[in-house]
């Protein structure tokens, strides 16, 4: 058994039928020795007296709030989690296997530039009585600061009968050198805890490894005199890291038909320019990604031909 | 410690392309050292990363962009001196900060070249005949290290006589590679930068 | 005392279905995945399926996939396993397993797929 | 299809020291605890060792297991007839974790 905050604390749980459980000794937060009475939850029902109360733990029904009372006055309140371990593992059972970039993903995270701000992502189909709270650091075994907000809500979906639910939370890295060469990786690590189940999940990282670019930006399309071509021009993200000629961008730009079935025609390159023919009813995307550390490619940014 | 903004002549920089040859060199060899040692622990999650200039070279600090040198987290410098007369220096107005910028690059290559090259003698007496070194990738480091023209004391291959731990070894290609390669982005940025100004 | 029994085993052409089952006593069966497995006669064990505790997530082995079905009754305590377009490699015992460093198994059931 | 490899057969006379060994990776032993069963002719396998190493109540101290690295081994200290049986480990990988990973079992005969 520890103590996650105050008052609050995680009982782990060997999870198999007819396990023996844990035992656990809760001690009543006062200075008062006699007249000692126990409670769980919203229930009158005495479960003990006396300044300690041992019970075993075994299932979801021995946890929830414990209670010791003086003479109908609340002395002191236990919340006990359940943090189950089911054959060596511990249970994710309140968020969902994102399955990319691999299996057993559950946190995603992606940087915009190498300023060491970061933000990370989690999916759920649970919609009440959930509550997550978030850490990171740069390394463990001599953490260096990082600092996150609170995760909020950040979309819901439908997905066949189930609505999903996805959290965010945003994370800055206290002293963060753009150029830095990282040798120790960010961890991050997130607490959930759902009625009375606790679990958590970690995620551990280079910026370098995450960094996804904004989409280009004010592409404009140019049409040459007496030609098909035109020149498509844009600009690097204002998001993105400074100077640019140090932290350069390669594009891709691509000539896409109306149907999904038509040909692609792609050109890659390191200016922010090129000449391409621009077909009846084609549209025009450039996407870009990191020059010298091959990344994930940004969202398109796209203009139509006409 | 930082690089000026106005440096060598346009089109008077031949380190660049040397420099981006490099990174491509350098990433398809440790593509195929993840490939062939799949049985390892090879990939970046797996490894430990070290980084075999720390506390002899600065490349880092010493080739910091003009622009970073507000950022107060950049400037953990490590004071280190370097011998500084190269031929990437183009120009009359090459500053002493980019020439200890340079030189800190040659070094790290330097000891780089070193390490493969040790290292490389012992994959060759490996019985399974595993992994070798790219030729490519050492040429290229030796073409970079050419065009930057460095005098500096050739360090001596290290030899060793006890029996080598292939094991091991493979382990340690992994962990040089992965260095090396991030070494490699940020020669190939400063390079980038420096063509630029 | 934990108990599975198993029931539903037979003989059946292939191409044609069978739905096993697999029922529990003496603990929550809501609250523990539940496995099949396999073993086809004079050979191992072979992993067929998982259901997690609240029959939100379901895992199949590549052998069986979208052809078994897996599922659960957590109010009638029983466990089941959907099996159709059945070929002669699945004629094996089938065994359930709760999931757990400590696991109870069912008795078997043969399932001969023959013409 | 099986990952967890084992001798297919290894032999004893009673009160020999048998071992049975299950070569795995890094993905499967590597990063997760194993587990041995005994099935017994006819019958459904019974759990030996649970956590690489642990016994559960019941089954004789002569069964003992250990993990190193990326294989795993069960050891019959003083074999005895009743111990005839086949022997399978199970683990599983760290990508398709809940998927139970069999070995491809071995038969323990005891001689005389």
């Known amino acids: 058994i520890w103590e996650l905050k105050k008052d609050v604390y995680v009982v782990e749980l060997d999870w198999y039928p007819d396990a023996p459980g844990e035992m656990v000794v809760l001690t009543c937060d006062t200075p008062e020795e006699d007249g000692i009475t126990w409670t769980l939850d919203q229930s009158s029902e005495v479960l003990g007296s006396g300044k300690t109360l041992t019970i075993q733990v075994k299932e979801f029904g021995d946890a929830g709030q414990y209670t010791c009372h003086k003479g109908g006055e609340v002395l002191s309140h236990s919340l006990l989690l359940l943090h189950k371990k089911e054959d060596g593992i511990w249970s994710t059972d309140i968020l969902k296997d994102q399955k990319e970039p691999k299996n057993k993903t559950f946190l995603r995270c992606e940087a915009k530039n190498y300023s060491g701000r970061f933000t990370c992502w989690w999916l759920t189909t649970i919609s009440t009585d959930l509550t997550f709270s978030v850490k990171s650091s740069r390394g463990s075994s001599d953490p260096q600061g990082v600092t996150c907000g609170a995760a909020t809500l950040s979309a819901e979906r439908v997905r066949g009968d189930n609505k999903e639910y996805e959290y965010s939370v945003e994370c800055q890295e206290d002293s963060a050198c753009p150029a830095a060469e990282e040798s120790l990786p960010i961890e991050v690590m997130v607490d959930a805890v759902h009625k009375l189940k606790y679990e958590n999940y970690t995620s551990s990282f280079f910026i370098r490894d995450i960094i996804k670019p904004d989409p280009p930006k004010n592409l404009q399309l140019k049409p040459l005199k007496n030609s098909r071509q035109v020149e498509v021009s844009w600009e690097y993200p204002d998001t993105w890291s400074t100077p640019h000629s140090y932290f350069s961008l390669t594009f891709c730009v691509q000539v896409q038909g109306k149907s999904k079935r038509e040909k692609k025609d792609r050109v890659f390159t390191d200016k922010t320019s090129a000449t391409v023919i621009c077909r009846k009813n084609a549209s025009i995307s450039v996407r870009a990604q990191d020059r010298y550390y091959s990344s994930s490619w940004s969202e398109w940014a796209s203009v139509p031909c006409s | 410690r930082n690089l000026p903004v106005a440096t060598p002549d346009p089109g008077m920089f031949p380190c660049l392309h040397h420099s981006q040859n490099l990174l491509r060199a350098v990433s398809n060899m440790l593509q195929k050292a993840r490939q062939t040692l799949e049985f390892y622990p090879c990939t970046s999650e797996e490894i430990d990363h070290e980084d075999i200039t720390k506390d002899k070279t600065s490349t880092v600090e010493a080739c910091l962009p003009l622009e970073l040198t507000k950022n107060e987290s950049c400037l953990n410098s490590r004071e280190t001196s370097f011998i500084t007369n190269g031929s990437c220096l183009a120009s009359r107005k090459t500053s002493f900060m980019m020439a200890l910028c340079l030189s800190s690059i040659y070094e790290d290559l330097k000891m780089y070249q070193v390490e493969f090259k040790t290292m490389n003698a012992k994959l060759l007496m490996d019985p399974k005949r595993q992994i070798f070194l790219d030729q490519n990738m050492l040429a290229v480091i030796d073409e970079l290290m050419q065009a930057l023209n460095f005098n500096s004391e050739t360090v001596p291959q290290k030899s060793s006589l006890e029996e080598p731990d292939f094991y091991k070894t493979k382990i340690k290609l992994c962990i040089l590679l992965h260095a090396f390669r991030i070494r490699a982005v940020t020669i190939d940025r400063v390079m980038s930068y420096l063509n630029a100004s | 005392q934990v108990q599975l029994v198993q029931s539903g085993g037979g003989v059946v052409q292939p191409g044609r279905s069978l739905r096993l089952s697999c029922a529990a006593s003496g603990f929550t069966f809501s609250s523990y995945g539940m496995h099949w497995v396999r073993q086809a006669p004079g050979k191992g064990l072979e992993w067929v399926a998982f259901i997690r505790y609240d029959g939100s997530n379901k895992y199949y082995a590549d052998s069986v996939k979208g052809r078994f079905t897996i599922s659960r009754d957590n109010s009638k305590n029983t466990l089941y396993l959907q099996m159709k377009s059945l070929r002669a490699e699945d004629t094996a015992v089938y065994y359930c397993k709760t999931h757990g460093s400590h696991d109870n198994w069912g008795q078997g059931t043969m399932v001969t797929v023959s013409s | 299809s099986y990952v967890l490899t084992q001798p297919p057969s290894v032999s004893g006379t009673p009160g020999q020291r048998v071992t049975i060994s299950c070569s795995g990776g890094?993905?499967?032993?590597?990063?997760?605890?194993v587990k041995w069963y005994q099935q017994l002719p006819g019958t459904a396998p019974k759990l030996l060792i649970y956590c690489n190493d642990q016994r559960p109540s019941g089954v004789p101290d002569r069964f003992s297991g250990s993990k190193s690295g990326t294989s795993a081994s069960l050891a019959i200290t003083g074999v005895q007839a009743e111990d005839e049986a086949d022997y399978y480990c199970q683990s599983y990988d760290r990508g398709t974790h809940p998927a139970l990973l069999f070995g491809t079992g071995t038969k323990v005969t005891v001689l005389g």
């Open positions: 890094r993905s499967n032993i590597g990063s997760n605890t």
